[in-house]
Interface confidence: low
Amino acid sequence: SAPGEDEECGRVRDFVAKLANNTHQHVFDDLRGSVSLSWVGDSTGVILVLTTFHVPLVIMTFGQSKLYRSEDYGKNFKDITDLINNTFIRTEFGMAIGPENSGKVVLTAEVSGGSRGGRIFRSSDFAKNFVQTDLPFHPLTQMMYSPQNSDYLLALSTENGLWVSKNFGGKWEEIHKAVCLAKWGSDNTIFFTTYANGSCKADLGALELWRTSDLGKSFKTIGVKIYSFGLGGRFLFASVMADKDTTRRIHVSTDQGDTWSMAQLPSVGQEQFYSILAANDDMVFMHVDEPGDTGFGTIFTSDDRGIVYSKSLDRHLYTTTGGETDFTNVTSLRGVYITSVLSEDNSIQTMITFDQGGRWTHLRKPENSECDATAKNKNECSLHIHASYSISQKLNVPMAPLSEPNAVGIVIAHGSVGDAISVMVPDVYISDDGGYSWTKMLEGPHYYTILDSGGIIVAIEHSSRPINVIKFSTDEGQCWQTYTFTRDPIYFTGLASEPGARSMNISIWGFTESFLTSQWVSYTIDFKDILERNCEEKDYTIWLAHSTDPEDYEDGCILGYKEAFLRLRKSSVCQNGRDYVVTKQPSICLCSLEDFLCDFGYYRPENDSKCVEQPELKGHDLEFCLYGREEHLTTNGYRKIPGDKCQGGVNPVREVKDLKKKCTSNFLSPEKQNSKSNSVPIILAIVGLMLVTVVAGVLIVKKYVCGGRFLVHRYSVLQQHAEANGVDGVDALDTASHTNKSGYHDDSDEDLL
């Protein structure tokens, strides 16, 4: 029988009446066009909906926007278009919502061609009131809030000027011209690249990287010959052109660009790219594209300084620059990532790591599923997950994998069961243990969302026909009940619930079509009466994460510690509530060799946890490039995995000695602060002075092991045995350029621009 249809299901009684009393319809009084929706603040209940309808005419675009506001999680909406003077809002800039609970909103208006600058509407009271402000420039990008101070905004203009506001968009100042890319760093620091000659494209690889820590009063040039840069966790990355050819290398800084080290990664050519797949304060997952148009590359994981890298996964699927990758951080369990590899026969297979990239394996076949036609052996196959790549290929996959940090262990995804991803219609699968085991949850493709920290899962069938039924489960997808939310089916366009999965409200968006007109409509359903009571202590059970062998004393140890969570029992139908906090008890593990990655110059043979010296480096002094100086390494081959908290047990010795030799080739790090007026002469002078140093630097780098394509296989191959290798919350990337991506964030050295 289909999942959830058996007699064991604990069904919610009288749910139809309970849901009917909590279903709220809102019909939007305008033509269909497009709709965008944003939550303003956390747990405020405030939603802004912007509908736009535009007709492109020969000379200009005629358009109309309407702005609606709800303060009860979408149950009721009020038309507030008059607050923005009925102005046409540019949808490509979206609604710029301020960080945390600042209550700030910026809408960017469409203005007629002849105007001096653009226009924005600003609110700092959760969109109750808006102030119109005319800009002294035409914005090229959405306004970017400083993560530390929501009054500080930056924007790029169509003329490539970098503009900053210190009073939430009231006054603007152009702090620099000829800017290609700008990003907020920590402590209200701004990083940006500039071009000297023609344009961003023309100067690619000859850009300069600048930093200002005082909102444009003073500047420091922290790099030249820049192709692009990216921020991830506490790391600042720059891809830098080599002196002699068209290759480029990654340099990394952990002090905001004051000092740089050359990452021990292969260099890439013009047609290749680097991409930061994930990063936090401990480490980085870096994708390095393979030469040629292969559609794949290699994932490397970094040490705690972002300098020494270990090969993590070969043949990682990543199509073209800025293309698609399935790399997904499973946020519901520490250390878990899912991605796809391109096998030798060009089929796509899903791989999962439970230890932050130490070892990758196939996903276990769901118990309640048969192997499909892609399987050679009908009894042995794996689950393969559909993510961004499948969606880009227009397979029947409406959603990427879903996990939430506060719904511990739950992962929901479309997939197929066989030897590779199938083009057949997928089903929906769920894991309740962070990806170790899977169960088929729903037949066929669905939209799905998690409510009340996992207490409720909601799904809607993906169909080309109008729909009027929603499914919900109160037991992590084991049993499902259906509710008809309207008599008149609608063309469904999306499920919307407040980010963070704490809400008990779900909004079903769609449109109705009649002979002459079509209108936007939303149905908001509140599940609070389904979960009638608050959860108590008896509703929770203790669950040891990453537990695979209960008889093993070290069971559950990942990255040097194990975590026991209090989790809601599947049989409990109660509210976790908006204030629910995940209860976990961490416990330190004793160190074993699995808590260490192989140090520079060492590698792990397959199926062995010991690190052995690389034959080609035996007897050589181990030297590598750190903070622009040659370092001598005394090691017995091990380095603690970033973020590993183990104590006691095995404790390999390691020592690094500064050789006082400069080795950062072709990278400029002037110590001098540049003021606005004198920056160019100083840079030119330094560049001149540096030419000699650069040549010397190249020779040193060539002599030692600080660079060069031949180094690829010198990084520790950790696929087999690093058992304790996970990190928390790796979603710390600057994702401004990836608003269209779902399910992963990446910062590629090309599509940053």
């Epitope: 209960p550 008889e551 008890q585 416990s587 330190i588 104590q647």
Partner: antibody, heavy 129, light 107 residues
Framework: QVQLVQSGAEVKKPGASVKVSCKAS????????MSWVRQAPGQGLEWMGI????????SYAQKFQGRVTMTRDTSTSTVYMELSSLRSEDTAVYYC??????????????????????WGQGTTVTVSS | EIVMTQSPATLSVSPGERATLSCRAS??????LAWYQQKPGQAPRLLIY???TRATGIPARFSGSGSGTEFTLTISSLQSEDFAVYYC?????????FGGGTKVEIK
């Protein structure tokens, strides 16, 4: 050899507090948890709580919650157990015991349990007015 | 919390005879169970861990068995030094709990 040496006997008045120390030697202090167990005269063993010497995190039995505080000093490899608001029924011998537990009393220590393999000699605490 | 019940409370056995002590858990503790021996005026001493593994230095006459909720400590041939109180203890779920003890006395 591995040993746990506890502080000497104490006589306290009701309402007072007592702080018992337990000094570990012969092994890496941070590699094992430490449990405290007490035994009233003529009675059985009663587990009070556990401390993880690495971070100092603790877990106490419900009965002692709010009255017991377990701390550690890694520089001297010593753990301490302080019991406040003493009453006559707290008269007992208090033991520290090395406990290799993986999950400190938070649950499912669902893996091989090695038992409290090394015990202190015990500290007699008498509560009397 | 998990309640551990030991039986009998007192066991009278002659030296050289076999002694069988029982320990029952109110819910499954898997094999996360230990047995201790305590003599008057002394601290407890670990005998068995993991339900069935003898601790270092414990004579072979002591053996443990069981899993889940039912456990047994067997002393195959009682020696004079074995007359003491024996406690079982679970470490499956916090708080750790001990049984009430079984006193093995000379018959």
């Amino acid at each position: 050899q591995v040993q746990l040496v506890q502080s000497g006997a104490e006589v306290k008045k009701p309402g007072a507090s007592v702080k018992v120390s337990c000094k570990a030697s012969g092994y890496t202090f941070t590699s094992r948890y430490m449990s405290w167990v007490r035994q009233a005269p003529g009675q059985g063993l009663e587990w009070m709580g556990i401390i993880n010497p690495v971070g100092g995190s603790t877990s106490y039995a419900q009965k002692f919650q709010g009255r017991v505080t377990m701390t550690r000093d890694t520089s001297t490899s010593t753990v301490y157990m302080e019991l406040s608001s003493l009453r006559s029924e707290d008269t007992a011998v208090y033991y520290c015991a090395r406990d290799p537990s993986g999950i400190a009393a938070a649950g499912p220590a669902s893996r091989y349990y090695y038992g409290m393999d090394v015990w202190g000699q015990g500290t007699t605490v008498t509560v009397s007015s | 919390e998990i309640v551990m019940t030991q039986s009998p409370a007192t066991l009278s056995v002659s030296p050289g005879e076999r002694a069988t002590l029982s320990c029952r858990a109110s819910q499954s503790v898997s094999s996360n169970l230990a047995w201790y021996q305590q003599k008057p005026g002394q601290a407890p001493r670990l005998l068995i861990y993991g339900a069935s593994t003898r601790a270092t230095g414990i004579p072979a006459r002591f053996s443990g068995s069981g899993s889940g909720t039912e456990f047994t400590l067997t002393i195959s041939s009682l020696q004079s030094e074995d007359f003491a109180v024996y406690y079982c203890q679970q470490a499956r779920l916090g708080p750790w709990t001990f049984g009430g003890g079984t006193k093995v006395e000379i018959k």
